[in-house]
């Protein structure tokens, strides 16, 4: 694969990663695909410091991250271990709420207006954040 040594235009560098903040909305899966088309992934939050950085850039707006439990357990899109990793859920979240009337529960995680996390219906058109690591050879995932 190829190595990225500096961030693309319109991306923000922070702690050896590049971040791109959308200004419009997509469903979680479409946002995920968008990041893949950018050779990136939905943001994976691994520390309080990274949480504060992302929160600062997105402001008080619902924003998708790369965390979901569509196949059962919660998983980060880049394979980062969820159980042992950083978490910042709102109180009593995630709750897989079924009361929204849209069918099913809530399988995708997003930053809320105060930065803490909530699980929500994956089809909601929220903003999103893409992330790609610098100095890391790009992988060749399977065809979609």
């Amino acid at each position: 694969g190829s190595e990225r040594t500096c961030c693309p235009v319109n991306w923000v560098e922070h702690e050896r990663s590049c971040y791109w903040f959308s200004r419009s909305g997509k469903a979680w899966a479409d946002a995920d695909n968008y990041c893949r088309l950018e050779d990136a992934h939905l943001v994976v939050v691994t520390s309080w410091e990274e949480q504060k950085f992302v929160q600062h850039h997105i402001g008080p707006v619902n924003t998708w991250m790369g965390l979901h439990d569509q196949n059962g357990p919660w998983k980060w899109v880049d394979g980062t271990d969820y159980e042992t990793g950083f978490k910042n859920w709102r109180p009593e979240q995630p709750d897989d709420w079924y009361g929204h009337g849209l069918g099913g529960g809530e399988d995708c995680a997003h930053f809320t207006d105060d930065g803490r996390w909530n699980d929500d219906v994956c089809q909601r058109p929220y903003r999103w954040v893409c992330e790609t690591e610098l100095d890391k050879a790009s992988q060749e995932p399977p065809l979609l």
């Epitope: 694969g1 319109n10 997509k26 695909n33 950018e38 050779d39 995932p141 065809l143």
Partner: antibody, heavy 121, light 107 residues
Amino acid sequence: EVQLLESGGGLAQPGGSLRLSCAASGFTFSSYAMTWVRQAPGKGLEWVSAISGSGGNTFNADSVKGRFTISRDNSKNTLYLQMNSLRAEDTAVYYCAKLGIDYYYYGMDVWGQGTTVTVSS
Amino acid sequence: DIQMTQSPSSVSASVGDRVTITCRASQDITTWLAWYQQKPGKAPKLLIYDASSLQSAVPSRFSGSGSGTDFTLTVSSLQPEDFATYYCLQTNSFPWTFGQGTKVEIK
């Protein structure tokens, strides 16, 4: 000047193969996702495939999945479409196009002139 | 898949006329919509992106509007070079899909 030049079209038999190429110039090729779009004779436009800048991620229309493969060689500034198991309904003009408008994937801003693929026995 | 339905399929108009073409998405695509112009034997040309943003070097007589599921392309005063076929494209979700096209013909 940004330019895209397709080649490789021609006549193929049903079940046969062709490889289309698209030579890019005038921009940093590896920084942009690319796509193929086709147009059957007298018909509308149909999106076929897209590929990320590194080539690491690809997306395909259901109509070509398992038969067509999009790829790129950034050292040669060239985009490819490998077309296998060709069918009569694949007959079309094939366009390559550059993705990215205002740093967003709102669509294709630069197109090649197209190359014609005819599938017939 | 998201279906894009354009109307009308063709329209006859005269130079100076105001022409409006609509595109309806089968589900919400916010503003992930572009409009293209295509002339016979030529590649499509981008006119509008993000539903309402005018591509550079495109004449200001072209404008786009809409969000969600209903979108409009308007040519405020048709010029001889505007007789062509127009397509909408959604890039909200894969597979990306085009409308079936609207042919603008000389009356």
